[in-house]
Amino acid sequence: EAIQVTQPSVVLASSHGVASFPCEYSPSHNTDEVRVTVLRQTNDQMTEVCATTFTEKNTVGFLDYPFCSGTFNESRVNLTIQGLRAVDTGLYLCKVELMYPPPYFVGMGNGTQIYVIDPEPCPDSD
C-alpha cells in the first residue's frame, strides 16, 4: 500500500560538504514506528546510503551512520548528509515505510539532486 513522499528536487551542499533536506509523507496515520532509508541512484542502480527507524521515543535517527543524521516530527523527517565531496553529486531518494501499526505503507520520493562542489584549496601564503 502506497504513501506519497515529497522531497526537494535540488539541494546544493555547503562548502563543508553538508547537505540538508526535508522528506515528508502523506497520508500520515498515528504511527509508532517509521523506517526511513536514504538511497543514491546511479545509472540504474540504487545503493543504500543510510537507514534508521524512528519511534515516538526515538526521534533522532541514523546513530549508526557517521555521515547521516536526521530528526523526525509527525510526518516530516529532516535529513542531513555530511562528508560529501564532488564525486558524491547525484540523486538521493528518500524511502519511507510505516512499520507499526499495520497496515504496512511504503513510498519513495522522486529524489533530491545534491550538487557538491569541492572547495578550492587555499593558496600557499608566503
Partner: antibody, heavy 117, light 107 residues
Framework: EVQLVESGGGLVQPGGSLRLSCAAS????????IHWVRQAPGKGLEWVAS????????DYADSVKGRFTISADTSKNTAYLQMNSLRAEDTAVYYC??????????WGQGTLVTVSS | DIQMTQSPSSLSASVGDRVTITCRAS??????VAWYQQKPGKAPKLLIY???SLYSGVPSRFSGSRSGTDFTLTISSLQPEDFATYYC?????????FGQGTKVEIK
C-alpha cells in the same frame, strides 16, 4: 471479502504437538499483522502470539514462549501456530485475527484444541 | 509486559441504561487500545480501535475515550442485543494483552 479460516485443532495428549493454520483471503496478507488469541472454556480472551511478514517480526505471550512458534507463508497467505509440549492449560478455542491500526478487525471462527490423556 | 486491569468484572443493567467499562494500563500505551464485544460461542467483534475510533458498522451508542492510562468504553443507551461480554486490549509495540472482561447482564 476478508476471510480468516483456522484449521488443525483436535485432541492431543499432554506433551504432544499440533500445528494450527490460518488461511487468509480478500486482502494483502503481507501488509498486516496476524495474531493468535485463545479462549479456555468459560474464561476470557488470552493473547498468544503475533507475526508480521513485512517487518520480519514475531512476539509471544510469556505463557507460550519457547513452546509455540508462529510463522507465515506469504505465498500461501497462511499463518501457522506450531504448538509443542502441550499442557492441559493450553486447552482452548484458538482464533486467528488480522490487526489493522490498533484493533483486530477480522477474526476467524476458531478451532478447538483439547489437551487431555 | 503491560497489564490491562478491567473493571467491573460484571454488571447488571436495564435496557436504556448508560454503561461504562474501564481499563487501566500498567504503563503508557498511547492510543493503542481496542474494545471488543463477544457473545457465547462466537468470535469477538471489534467495536472501538485506536482508543476512540468507532469501527465501521458499529452503532454510535458505543464510544471510547482515553485519559492518560485509563481507557473507557461507554454504551450510551443499552439495547437488548448489547448484553454480552466486553474486552479491552492493548496493542502497543511488543506483547499484547487483554483485560479480564466485563459481563453485561440483564437486571
Amino acid at each position: 471479502e476478508v476471510q480468516l479460516v483456522e484449521s488443525g485443532g483436535g485432541l492431543v495428549q499432554p506433551g504432544g504437538s499440533l500445528r494450527l493454520s490460518c488461511a487468509a483471503s480478500g486482502f494483502t496478507f503481507s501488509s498486516y499483522y496476524i495474531h493468535w488469541v485463545r479462549q479456555a472454556p468459560g474464561k476470557g480472551l488470552e493473547w498468544v502470539a503475533s507475526i508480521s511478514s513485512y517487518a520480519d517480526y514475531t512476539d509471544y505471550a510469556d505463557s507460550v514462549k519457547g513452546r509455540f512458534t508462529i510463522s507465515a507463508d506469504t505465498s500461501k497467505n497462511t499463518a501457522y501456530l506450531q504448538m509443542n509440549s502441550l499442557r492441559a492449560e493450553d486447552t482452548a478455542v484458538y482464533y486467528c485475527a488480522r490487526q489493522s491500526y490498533y484493533g483486530l478487525d477480522y477474526w476467524g471462527q476458531g478451532t478447538l484444541v483439547t489437551v487431555s490423556s | 509486559d503491560i497489564q490491562m486491569t478491567q473493571s467491573p468484572s460484571s454488571l447488571s443493567a436495564s435496557v436504556g441504561d448508560r454503561v461504562t467499562i474501564t481499563c487501566r494500563a500498567s504503563q503508557s500505551v498511547s492510543s493503542a487500545v481496542a474494545w471488543y464485544q463477544q457473545k457465547p460461542g462466537k468470535a469477538p467483534k471489534l467495536l472501538i480501535y485506536s482508543a476512540s475510533s468507532l469501527y465501521s458498522g458499529v452503532p454510535s451508542r458505543f464510544s471510547g475515550s482515553r485519559s492518560g492510562t485509563d481507557f473507557t468504553l461507554t454504551i450510551s443507551s443499552l439495547q437488548p442485543e448489547d448484553f454480552a461480554t466486553y474486552y479491552c486490549q492493548q496493542l502497543s509495540r511488543g506483547p499484547s494483552t487483554f483485560g479480564q472482561g466485563t459481563k453485561v447482564e440483564i437486571k
